[in-house]
C-alpha cells in the first residue's frame, strides 16, 4: 500500500445526528483540507472510497451499500444514511486516491437518540436575539440538499415539549420562527421537525436550537466604572493591606471584547517591581450584559506606593474610559501624652 | 420632561372607526416601545397592543386583533392607534405608556376616552 | 396567557397603618411583575418594578417583595394621598396582563 496523506481524526468535526433520521454528511477533505473541489478530482480521475470504525472497534471495515433500500449509499462527495440506526455511530474515513495520490481523513460520526420531549446529549447551537427589537427570525438549519425544491415538506415547530400555535409574540412561518419584541421568556430550546416524502417513504428531520435573548445594541454603552469612585478614599498606613476593586460593567455588545485593566503611575503592573496581585471576577445579567471585577492587592503598602496614581481602565467596542482611585497616607492619630500636650504648651 | 398627550377620541357608531394619537416629548421616543392600555368605565386596566421602537414589531390582545393597528411615526415622535369595526365593548379611556422590557409602563399619558353607542 | 390575581379587592386601612396588598400569578413571571397607583381620573403611575425596585420618585413606604408567583406590596404608614387603586402587572410573557385591581380606602 503506497504512502497516503492522512488528516488523521477530525475531531473538530464532531458528528452529531439523530436515530432513525436521515443524514448526509459531505467528505470534510473537499471542505477543510484540499484546495480542490470534488467535481474537479472527479475529472481528473480521483475515486473517493468511503470506510468506517465501528465504535469501540479498532478495524477498518468497509460500508455496506447493499443494504435494504439503500439504507447507506454515497451521491459524489456526500455519505447518505436513509435512516440513521444507534449502531452507525462510528469513526468515518473519506480517501480520494488513484494510481499516484491518496488523501484521506477520518471523522466520528455519533448518532444519538431523543426523548419525546426532543432531549438528547446533541450540542445545541445557540441562537442570540436582541431584547425588545421589532421581528427577528430564525431558521430551521442543516435541512439543506435533502429534499428538492419541487417537494414542499411540512414544519412543524416547538418550545421545548410544546407546539407552537397561539404563541402570542412567536409565530412560525414555514422554515422560519418569528419572534416579535423578544422577552427573556422568550428564551429556550426551539425543535423544527421537518416531514417530507421520498420514494413512497416519509422522512422526519429534527433541528433544535438554543435561543438566547441578550441585551440590545440600542441600549448599549460605554463601560461603566462603579468603582473606583470619587466617594470613596482609600486611606491607608504603611505596612497594612491596599484592596482596591476595579468594577465595570459592560452593556452586552454581539462579538465585542471587554477589557478590564490597572495602571500604576502609568505603567501595567507587571512592568513595575512591587509586589502587586490582581483578582479578577466575571458576572453576567439576564441579557448577558457583564459586569467584571479587578481587585488590585498590595500585601504591605509603602508610604511610596501610597504617593502612586493608581487608575482602572476599561474597553468594549463602544469606547474607553479610565478612573482613578483616590489614595492617601492615613494620618496617624496623635498620642495625648506627648503630642497633645505639647500642642497646650506643657513643659 | 417625559410628557404622552393623547388625542382622537370621541363617540362613534357600533362599527365605525376612529384613529388615536399620542404625541410623545422629553425623551428619544425612537428608542422606547410603545403600547395602548385601555380601561373601560369603572373597571381595570387592559393591555391592547404594542410596537417595537422601530415600528417593526407589533402585538395585540386577541380582544382587538384584526380590527385595531398600531404605528408610530419616529420623525413627528407620535403613536397611533387606527380602530376599525368598533363594538360597545370597546368603550373605554384610552392610554399610551411608553415601556421597557426592565422597567414595564414607566410613564402614562392622560387618556383619550372612546365612547361607542349608537 | 397569564393571569393575575389580586387580594383583596378592597382594603380598609386608617391613615398611619401599615397596608399589604397581595398579587398572584397563574404561573411563574420570575421578578417581571410592577405595581401601579391609580387615583380616580388619573393615569396609572408606576411604584415598583422588578418586583421590588421603587421607581423614580416613590416615596420608600411603599416596597415590593416576592418572586415566581407570589407578591405583595407593602405600604408601611399610609398618608392621605396613598388612598387609590393599585394594580399589579406581569411583564414576563406578552400579553402583559394586569389584576383586577385592589382598592385601598379610608377605614
Known amino acids: 500500500s503506497e504512502r497516503c496523506d492522512d488528516w488523521g481524526l477530525d475531531t473538530m468535526r464532531q458528528i452529531q445526528v439523530f436515530e432513525d433520521e436521515p443524514a448526509r454528511i459531505k467528505c470534510p477533505l473537499f471542505e477543510h483540507f484540499l484546495k480542490f473541489n470534488y467535481s474537479t478530482a472527479h475529472s481528473a480521475g480521483l475515486t473517493l472510497i468511503w470506510y468506517w470504525t465501528r465504535q469501540d472497534r479498532d478495524l477498518e471495515e468497509p460500508i455496506n451499500f447493499r443494504l435494504p433500500e439503500n439504507r447507506i449509499s454515497k451521491e459524489k462527495d456526500v455519505l447518505w444514511f436513509r435512516p440513521t440506526l444507534l449502531n452507525d455511530t462510528g469513526n468515518y474515513t473519506c480517501m480520494l486516491r488513484n494510481t499516484t495520490y491518496c488523501s484521506k481523513v477520518a471523522f466520528p460520526l455519533e448518532v444519538v437518540q431523543k426523548d419525546s420531549c426532543f432531549n438528547s446529549p446533541m450540542k445545541l447551537p445557540v441562537h442570540k436575539l436582541y431584547i425588545e427589537y421589532g421581528i427577528q427570525r430564525i431558521t430551521c438549519p442543516n435541512v439543506d440538499g435533502y429534499f428538492p425544491s419541487s417537494v414542499k415538506p411540512t414544519i412543524t415547530w416547538y418550545m421545548g415539549c410544546y407546539k407552537i400555535q397561539n404563541f402570542n409574540n412567536v409565530i412560525p412561518e414555514g422554515m422560519n420562527l418569528s419572534f416579535l419584541i423578544a422577552l427573556i421568556s422568550n428564551n429556550g430550546n426551539y425543535t423544527c421537525v421537518v416531514t417530507y416524502p421520498e420514494n413512497g417513504r416519509t422522512f422526519h428531520l429534527t433541528r433544535t436550537l438554543t435561543v438566547k435573548v441578550v441585551g440590545s445594541p440600542k441600549n448599549a454603552v460605554p463601560p461603566v466604572i462603579h468603582s473606583p469612585n470619587d466617594h470613596v478614599v482609600y486611606e491607608k498606613e504603611p505596612g497594612e493591606e491596599l484592596l482596591i476593586p476595579c468594577t465595570v460593567y459592560f452593556s452586552f455588545l454581539m462579538d465585542s471584547r471587554n477589557e478590564v485593566w490597572w495602571t500604576i503611575d502609568g505603567k501595567k503592573p507587571d512592568d513595575i517591581t512591587i509586589d502587586v496581585t490582581i483578582n479578577e471576577s466575571i458576572s453576567h445579567s439576564r441579557t448577558e450584559d457583564e459586569t467584571r471585577t479587578q481587585i488590585l492587592s498590595i500585601k504591605k503598602v509603602t508610604s511610596e506606593d501610597l504617593k502612586r496614581s493608581y487608575v482602572c481602565h476599561a474597553r468594549s467596542a463602544k469606547g474607553e474610559v479610565a478612573k482613578a482611585a483616590k489614595v492617601k497616607q492615613k494620618v496617624p492619630a496623635p498620642r495625648y501624652t506627648v503630642e497633645l500636650a505639647c500642642g497646650f504648651g506643657a513643659t | 420632561e417625559v410628557q404622552l398627550l393623547e388625542s382622537g377620541g370621541g363617540l362613534v357608531q357600533p362599527g365605525g372607526s376612529l384613529r388615536l394619537s399620542c404625541a410623545a416629548s422629553g425623551f428619544t421616543f425612537s428608542h422606547y416601545g410603545m403600547s395602548w392600555v385601555r380601561q373601560a368605565p369603572g373597571k381595570g386596566l387592559e393591555w391592547v397592543s404594542a410596537?417595537?421602537?422601530?415600528?417593526?414589531?407589533?402585538l395585540y390582545a386577541d380582544s382587538v386583533k384584526g380590527r385595531f393597528t398600531i404605528s408610530r411615526d419616529n420623525s413627528k415622535n407620535t403613536l397611533y392607534l387606527q380602530m376599525n369595526s368598533l363594538r360597545a365593548e370597546d368603550t373605554a379611556v384610552y392610554y399610551c405608556?411608553?415601556?421597557?422590557?426592565?422597567?414595564?409602563?414607566?410613564?402614562w399619558g392622560q387618556g383619550t376616552l372612546v365612547t361607542v353607542s349608537s | 396567557e397569564i393571569v393575575m390575581t389580586q387580594s383583596p379587592a378592597t382594603l380598609s386601612v386608617s391613615p398611619g397603618e401599615r397596608a399589604t396588598l397581595s398579587c398572584r400569578a397563574s404561573q411563574s413571571v420570575s421578578s417581571n411583575l410592577a405595581w401601579y397607583q391609580q387615583k380616580p381620573g388619573q393615569a396609572p403611575r408606576l411604584l415598583i418594578y422588578?418586583?421590588?425596585t421603587r421607581a423614580t420618585g416613590i416615596p420608600a413606604r411603599f416596597s415590593g417583595s416576592g418572586s415566581g408567583t407570589e407578591f405583595t406590596l407593602t405600604i408601611s404608614s399610609l398618608q392621605s394621598e396613598d388612598f387609590a387603586v393599585y394594580y399589579c402587572?406581569?411583564?414576563?410573557?406578552?400579553?402583559?396582563?394586569f389584576g383586577q385591581g385592589t382598592k385601598v380606602e379610608i377605614k
Open positions: 422588578g418586583a421590588s
Open positions: 410596537i417595537s421602537y422601530d415600528g417593526e414589531g407589533t
Open positions: 402587572q406581569q411583564y414576563n410573557n406578552w400579553p402583559w396582563t
Open positions: 405608556a411608553r415601556f421597557r422590557y426592565y422597567t414595564a409602563f414607566d410613564y
